[in-house]
């Protein structure tokens, strides 16, 4: 029985040319996490974090993706095309697969600065 839940950073926005951290956290389960896969909206893999072997960043993203912090992922040099859904897929034993969703909106610099100015602290 799958008892775990995934908490994510939810809907986030970031500035074009900037960077953003994608974070997921699996809780409420004793299952062993064997692998965490990070996927983009078009279902292409960005990175794999294996519990014993560490990180594998996919060749197409090596320039713009940095591992961490933790099991999270940092996207750098953001473009407007990076807007969309991102998924963290936790492969666990014996539970199976848990999946979290994050929506990233990449904003033009001026828009991002404007919206940040009016955020509630």
């Amino acid at each position: 029985m799958m008892t775990g839940t995934i908490e994510t950073t939810g809907n986030i926005s970031a500035k074009k040319g900037g960077s953003v951290i994608l974070q997921c956290h699996l809780s409420s389960t004793m299952a062993q996490v064997t692998q965490v896969n990070w996927e983009q909206h078009d279902h292409s893999l960005l990175a794999i974090r294996n519990a014993e072997l560490g990180w594998h960043i996919y060749p197409a993203f090596k320039d713009r993706v940095a591992p961490g912090p933790g099991l999270g992922l940092t996207l750098q040099s953001l473009t407007m095309n990076d807007t969309g859904e991102y998924f963290c897929t936790y492969h666990t034993y014996p539970d199976g697969t848990y999946r979290g969703r994050i929506f990233l909106e990449v904003l033009e610099s001026s828009v991002a600065e404007h919206s940040a100015r009016f955020q509630i602290p």
């Epitope: 292409s44 014993e52 072997l53 594998h56």
Partner: antibody
């Protein structure tokens, strides 16, 4: 260049423990991942498990209760023990290296393989 | 476990002609797929990783493509030295699993 060489008995009796060793040259086993993969006659290649650069292990759940992978860093070798063997464990056993950082789960160096037959 | 199914089981190709091997995953594995070549009497050798990236030293007549559940290994012009068995493998989730192999022969 990385070289791997399997060694161990070619014949094991049912219910006994299969023991194989892989000697690695040209590379330190304290880097990357060191794997055991087997192929029973006429069947698919099957992942048995691996030991990581740090000494952590992963075992295929289908074999987990019977498998132990260990290493001896002073000799630069790693070993496989498979207990309570049956005829179904008859296979060619390969040791292999995996550079996860660069190639993910793709195995980039393989030993020549050693045939193990389980029979009384 | 994810099941990788290869077709055809065997392939007989005239030298200089193209060859294509298919691999189907039982569930979506994105692009976490590798291809290996096993020549007669030898151990498997890595050819392709991440579905479409050629490993060091692999001739450019070999190419990999696909994502999701359907993957293909193509040889643009088969040469005599290409005979052997070709295997696909997924590493999207553990346990990592292999296809049953496709035997390539020369006509």
């Amino acid at each position: 260049e990385v070289q791997l060489q399997e060694s161990g008995p070619g014949l094991v009796k049912p219910s006994e423990t299969l023991s194989l060793t892989c000697a690695v040259s040209g590379y330190s086993i304290t880097s990357d991942s060191w794997n055991w993969i087997r192929q029973p006659p006429g069947k698919k290649l099957e992942y048995i498990g691996y030991i990581s650069y740090s000494g952590n292990t992963y075992y295929n759940p289908s074999l987990k209760s019977r498998v132990t992978i260990s290493r001896d860093t002073s000799k630069n070798q790693f070993s496989l023990k498979l207990s309570s063997v049956t005829a179904a464990d008859t296979a060619v056993y390969y040791c292999a290296r995996l550079d996860f950082s660069n190639y993910g789960g793709a195995v980039d160096y393989w030993g020549q393989g050693t045939t193990v037959t389980v029979s009384s | 476990d994810i099941v990788m199914t290869q077709t055809p089981l065997s392939l007989s190709v005239t030298p200089g002609q193209p060859a294509s091997i298919s691999c189907k995953a039982s569930q979506n594995v994105r692009t976490a797929v590798a291809w290996y070549q096993q020549k007669p009497g030898q151990s498997p050798q890595l050819m392709i990783y991440s579905a479409s990236y050629r490993y060091t030293g692999v001739p450019d007549r070999f190419s990999g493509s696909g994502s999701g559940t359907d993957f293909t290994l193509k040889i643009s012009r088969v040469e005599a030295e290409d005979v052997g068995v070709y295997y696909c493998q997924q590493y999207y989730t553990t346990p990592w699993t292999f296809g049953g192999g496709t035997k390539v022969e020369i006509k």
